[in-house]
């Protein structure tokens, strides 16, 4: 079939409205003016254009803005955003949080696509750092967003932004990421009192060093086993039986169920059996009485 290029008489679009859904692909191409489309982008979202029709509208905008769309158009892209490629998005300069929110709203219910990842990357780089409002917005749409960042990227998160982080936002973070986030959280929450501080810092404790865990054990925090199991093994090993008992409070009984799993298993191997026996939980595998424990790592450090 020969490609039809002339707009049929009486079909020239005077505005972007519902009547356009009856236009065939070639009619949209021929009868809709790109400049009109750009000024009435906000209407597109309310009209159930098919994928094929959205492709035509995108093509018209691409021709009008070969160097990338202006933010006034980007903000009103609506479902047309789903048709954009990461290459398209790299041409954009998105500075408004409202624009970001509008586009994330369009993608709601979908996984974080390469398009969204590129958009976020462009936005954050443009801002220079991941400020609190941006982080608030991103974690609201994508709870796992923070854990998708590299430790290097996380280092640009200012401590003030940590207030926006919810426990579920850290569910998929690995120890390397928590190592970066924990000091920021400690700084952010430093002026809170004991029990309030523990509630806030709890989700970040997978990055806490031994000395901080020792300090917490003096504050009657009653850490739950789920949190304890996420602690760094190297941070747990130096803790004494008495310190772990204080740290866990009534939850100490849960150690029995976890005695074969890290970090509990490794911690048990480092404790004297008679110290473990004082817990009355039947934990086995500690150092038998009368044995001398040499800390070879300390010896190496001294030599």
């Amino acid at each position: 079939e020969v490609e039809k290029t002339a707009c049929p008489s009486g079909k020239k679009a005077r505005e972007i409205d519902e009547s356009l859904i009856f236009y065939k692909k070639w009619e949209l191409e021929a009868c809709v003016d790109a400049a009109l489309l750009a000024t009435q982008m906000d209407r597109v979202n309310a009209i159930p254009f098919t994928y094929e029709q959205l492709d035509v509208l995108k093509h018209k905008l691409d021709e009008l803005y070969p160097q990338g769309y202006p933010e006034s158009v980007i903000q009103h892209l609506g479902y047309l955003f789903l048709k954009m490629s990461p290459e398209d998005i790299r041409k954009w300069n998105v500075t408004s949080l409202e624009t970001l929110k509008a586009l994330l709203e369009v993608n709601k219910g979908h996984e974080m696509s390469p398009q969204v990842a590129t958009l976020i990357d462009r936005f954050v780089k443009g801002r220079g750092q991941l400020d609190k409002d941006t982080l608030d917005t991103l974690t609201a749409f994508y709870p796992g967003y923070l854990c998708s960042l590299s430790p290097e990227e996380l280092s640009s998160v200012p401590p003030s932004s940590i207030w926006a982080v919810r426990p579920q936002d850290l569910d998929t973070c690995d120890p390397r990421q928590l190592d970066v986030l924990y000091p920021k959280a400690r700084l952010a929450f430093q002026n809170m009192n004991g029990s309030e501080y523990f509630v806030k810092i709890q989700s970040f404790l997978g990055g806490a060093p031994t000395e901080d865990l020792k300090a917490l054990s003096q504050q009657n925090v009653s850490m739950d086993l789920a949190t304890f199991m996420k602690l760094r093994t190297d941070a747990v090993l130096p803790l004494t039986v008495a310190e772990v008992q204080k740290l866990l409070g009534p939850h100490v009984e849960g150690l029995k169920a976890e005695e074969r799993h890290r970090p509990v298993r490794d911690w048990i191997l480092r404790q004297r059996q008679d110290d473990l026996d004082t817990l009355g939980l039947g934990l086995q595998g500690g150092i038998p009485n009368g044995y001398l424990v040499l800390d070879l790592s300390m010896q190496e450090a001294l030599s």
């Epitope: 519902e18 009547s19 859904i21 009856f22 692909k25 159930p48 098919t50 994928y51 094929e52 029709q53 959205l54 492709d55 609506g78 479902y79 047309l80 789903l82 048709k83 369009v106 219910g109 979908h110």
Partner: antibody, heavy 120, light 106 residues
Framework: QVQLVESGGGLVKPGGSLRLSCAAS????????MSWIRQAPGKGLEWVSY????????YYADSVKGRFTISRDNAKNSLYLQMNSLRAEDTAVYYC?????????????WGQGTLVTVSS | IQLTQSPSSLSASVGDRVTITCRAS??????LAWYQQKPGKAPKLLIY???SLESGVPSRFSGSGSGTDFTLTISSLQPEDFATYYC?????????FGGGTKVEIK
């Protein structure tokens, strides 16, 4: 919860007329495009007609064009399908469905359906 | 655009992995939805945009594909999954449905 309930189906002779109704509840009816979809006995699904949220834009499948009329009353949260000049091949269960538009167009939820039988 | 589903029917047992295909007569990007219909009931949306799971739909259902070939997979068939499944394209008007695939108990 979101609910659609069709009524008005029945037995009608070829050439006769019938008016189907669909009562919507649990959502803002006036915000959504609505559709009629039919299913002949033992057969697949056929999209018959849809109407825009305001009622200003209407679509009909070629098989019913000129014989069926879709309309809506947003004040009553109701959708209608006026069927004239009925033929034996119009025999089907007729479903009303809410159009969901999120860059694509699909149907959710559907009503329980009303059976239209065209037979002499 | 015509959608052809295959097979038109299949027999399977509880716990089986079931795959249904839908082929479009021309490329439709990812503009495809899947529905489940039980006897005497209305169709129910399972998947949209070829692979996005509708909320409330069990994760054993998954969709894949782009262009002309699409697949609905049920990873471990449950008793309540015995039904007829339809695909629907929304790449261009008129919106069309596949002929359906009936999943029966072996």
């Amino acid at each position: 919860q979101v609910q659609l309930v069709e009524s008005g189906g029945g037995l009608v002779k070829p050439g006769g007329s019938l008016r189907l109704s669909c009562a919507a509840s649990g959502f803002t009816f006036s915000d959504y495009y609505m559709s009629w979809i039919r299913q002949a006995p033992g057969k697949g699904l056929e999209w018959v007609s849809y109407i825009s949220s305001s009622g200003s834009t209407i679509y009909y499948a070629d098989s019913v064009k000129g014989r069926f009329t879709i309309s809506r009353d947003n004040a009553k949260n109701s959708l209608y399908l006026q069927m004239n000049s009925l033929r034996a091949e119009d025999t089907a269960v007729y479903y009303c469905a809410r159009n969901i538009y999120m860059g694509g167009i699909w149907f959710d939820p559907w009503g329980q359906g009303t059976l239209v039988t065209v037979s002499s | 655009i015509q959608l052809t589903q295959s097979p038109s029917s299949l027999s399977a047992s509880v716990g089986d992995r079931v795959t249904i295909t839908c082929r479009a007569s021309q490329g439709i990007s990812s503009a495809l939805a899947w529905y489940q219909q039980k006897p005497g009931k209305a169709p129910k949306l399972l998947i949209y945009d070829a692979s996005s799971l509708e909320s409330g739909v069990p994760s054993r259902f998954s969709g894949s594909g782009s262009g002309t070939d699409f697949t609905l997979t049920i990873s471990s068939l449950q008793p309540e999954d015995f039904a007829t499944y339809y695909c629907q394209q929304f790449n261009s008007y008129p919106l069309t449905f596949g002929g359906g695939t009936k999943v029966e108990i072996k």
